[in-house]
């Protein structure tokens, strides 16, 4: 988890801090977006359960040229124990529906807030 705090971090970041920072970034995205996030790009929806962080990254990493989510992509990579590349889908990632990136971020944010309230930081 060393890299979760970004370049300014002097050492390992507590999971609670990393999760809070990810939540803050998603809040920032949803509040500051004027036009549709990533101009309507659609990504695979995910099950917000075990393996959620890797699944979220696997979905979002396919979107290129959208600067608004680049920091989120980097932060999610810190939560995922394996390297994720575009076009890669784990068995946890059931491809049954696509949604706009904006909706994906909202859904993810709601779930992460719930996890934070419940003290589930990993």
């Amino acid at each position: 988890l060393t890299c979760l705090g970004g370049f300014a971090s002097p050492g390992p970041v507590p999971p609670s801090t990393a999760l809070r920072e990810l939540i803050e970034e998603l809040v920032n995205i949803t509040q500051n977006q004027k036009a549709p996030l990533c101009n309507g790009s659609m990504v695979w929806s995910i099950n917000l359960t075990a393996g959620m962080y890797c699944a979220a990254l696997e979905s979002l990493i396919n979107v290129s040229g959208c600067s608004a989510i680049e920091k989120t992509q980097r932060m999610l990579s810190g939560f995922c124990p394996h390297k994720v590349s575009a076009g890669q889908f784990s068995s946890l990632h059931v491809r049954d529906t696509k949604i706009e990136v904006a909706q994906f971020v909202k859904d993810l944010l709601l779930h992460l807030k719930k996890l934070f309230r419940e003290g589930q930081f990993n």
Partner: nanobody, 116 residues
Framework: EVQLLESGGGLVQPGGSLRLSCAAS????????MDWVRQAPGKGLEWVST????????YYADSVKGRFTISRDNSKNTLYLQMNSLRVEDTAVYYC?????????WGQGTLVTVSS
């Protein structure tokens, strides 16, 4: 420059069929998954279907499963959507899109109206 041109829409009665086409240019068509997305009047975007680059894997929204069939002809750089058993709620502008692209790169869409 990515260019997508949809065609085949029109007015059809409930229970009828239509076949939409999407002619693609400006990119290596057989290297990309492709989507069909629709927008009903006054509504948001709704994903309809996705097909893998080689056409072997297809995915459908629950609302169209069993009625719509996505396919592609990579030799013609063309994407298709066969729409059967059409319902009033299928009325929308249908867009084809290179998978994960923003709507900056979508075509102008083709209007499908299902009405008696």
């Amino acid at each position: 420059e990515v260019q997508l041109l949809e065609s085949g829409g029109g007015l059809v009665q409930p229970g009828g069929s239509l076949r939409l086409s999407c002619a693609a240019s400006g990119f290596t068509f057989d290297e990309y998954g492709m989507d069909w997305v629709r927008q009903a009047p006054g509504k948001g975007l709704e994903w309809v279907s996705t097909i893998s680059p080689n056409g072997q894997s297809t995915y459908y929204a629950d609302s169209v499963k069993g009625r719509f069939t996505i396919s592609r002809d990579n030799s013609k750089n063309t994407l298709y959507l066969q729409m059967n058993s059409l319902r009033v709620e299928d009325t929308a502008v249908y867009y084809c899109a290179k998978e994960y692209d923003s709507f900056d790169y979508w075509g102008q869409g083709t209007l499908v109206t299902v009405s008696s």
